[in-house]
């Protein structure tokens, strides 16, 4: 029998390289059975995950999964960092793995770097 626990399918150690000024949708795949849980996004600041308030979010439904989406309209350099979604389910909090956004500020980049170049520049997270 399939578990009816809520599960959040953000891939462990996942990364996205994105560009300031572009729109971007960060998806949190959510599996649930009867009742859709309340889901929120937070941004990591050290070991603390700070809840994102007043941001544009939406739900997208697919065959076996729902997606809780955080919209960046547009991406800002300050959006660089790691994000996590969490679900409230039966008075428990279920947390996803974190996913990291590497943001390139196109104003300071002569040309858009490749994903490989972005992957080799983790210090962008701390700049």
């Amino acid at each position: 029998k399939e578990s009816c626990d809520v599960q959040l399918y953000i891939k462990r150690q996942s990364y996205h390289s994105i560009f300031a000024g572009d729109p971007f949708k960060l998806e949190c795949p959510v599996k649930y059975c009867a009742h859709r849980p309340q889901v929120t996004w937070c941004k990591l600041n050290g070991t603390t995950c700070v809840k994102l308030e007043g941001r544009h979010t939406s739900w997208k439904q697919e065959k076996n999964l729902s997606f809780f989406i955080l919209h960046f309209e547009p991406v800002l350099p300050s959006d660089n960092g790691s994000y996590r979604c969490s679900a409230n389910f039966l008075s428990a909090i279920i947390e996803s793995h974190s996913t990291t956004l590497y943001v390139t500020d196109v104003k300071s980049a002569s040309e858009r770097p490749s994903k490989d170049e972005m992957a080799s520049r983790p210090w962008l997270l701390y700049s």
Partner: antibody, heavy 120, light 112 residues
């Protein structure tokens, strides 16, 4: 069932580029990570790198960083490895492997491997 | 890089004996999510590696229960309680916590 199959030329000339493909069936590659691992004759396993086919983001072993390029094609459900400026030291069996997802994140399924010899 | 050091490099045992393979990592493999991504693979000649154990001690489906894994932090052990002829292989530990991912150098198990 889940299957991975590597393919590519078995012989590559020194200073040339090794190009391999990993055809995946029985699962959707965008839901997983695909890794490349190699094994020189009589030696141990060496991790080359991985790709997230959902967005093309790669991570590499620094030993290969300047020479290895991993890519994927979601429409064909396959991943590829290119290794440039090869030498005899790159002669090995090359494997692709799937990293299963939540909650284990380990290399649960491997291709049979393809032998590549670097020789003129 | 995380260095994974296995010991011994090889061992020769009689059928029914207990095999113990150690794997030591140069840094803790405990991840931020509280899990330890240490895996054991078995590789027989001419075959790809096969996952035996994941998350330190979880046995893959179809793997005989004579295999077990234990450990934490930086020290891990693969145990075969009673070695069988079909266990002749090279065994590798692998860490999936840090980048780059790394394997141990392998331990060759033979039957005396």
């Amino acid at each position: 069932q889940v299957q991975l199959q590597e393919s590519g030329p078995g012989l590559v000339k020194p200073s040339g580029t090794l190009s391999l493909t990993c055809a995946d069936s029985g699962f959707n590659i965008k839901d997983t990570y695909i890794h490349w691992v190699r094994q020189p004759p009589g030696k141990g396993l060496e991790w080359i790198g991985r790709i997230d086919p959902a967005n093309g983001f790669t991570r590499y072993n620094p030993s290969f960083k300047s020479r290895a390029t991993i890519s994927s094609d979601k429409s064909k459900n396959q991943a590829s490895l290119k290794l440039s400026s090869v030498t005899a030291a790159d002669t090995a069996v090359y494997y692709c492997a799937r990293e299963d997802g939540y909650p284990y994140y380990t290399l649960d399924c491997w291709g049979q491997g393809t032998t590549v010899t670097v020789s003129s | 890089d995380i260095v994974m050091t296995q010991s011994p490099d090889s061992l020769a045992l009689s059928l029914g004996e207990r095999a113990t393979i150690n794997c030591k990592s140069s840094q803790s493999l405990l991840d931020v999510d509280g899990k330890t991504y240490l895996n054991w693979f078995q590789q027989k000649p001419g075959q790809p590696p096969k996952r035996l154990i994941y998350l330190v001690s979880k046995l893959d489906s179809g793997v005989p229960d004579r295999f077990s894994g234990s450990g934490s932090g930086t020290d891990f052990t693969l145990t075969i309680s009673s070695v069988q002829a079909e266990d002749v292989a090279v065994y590798y530990c692998w860490q999936g916590t840090h980048f780059p991912r790394t394997f141990g150098q392998g331990t060759k198990l033979e039957i005396k």
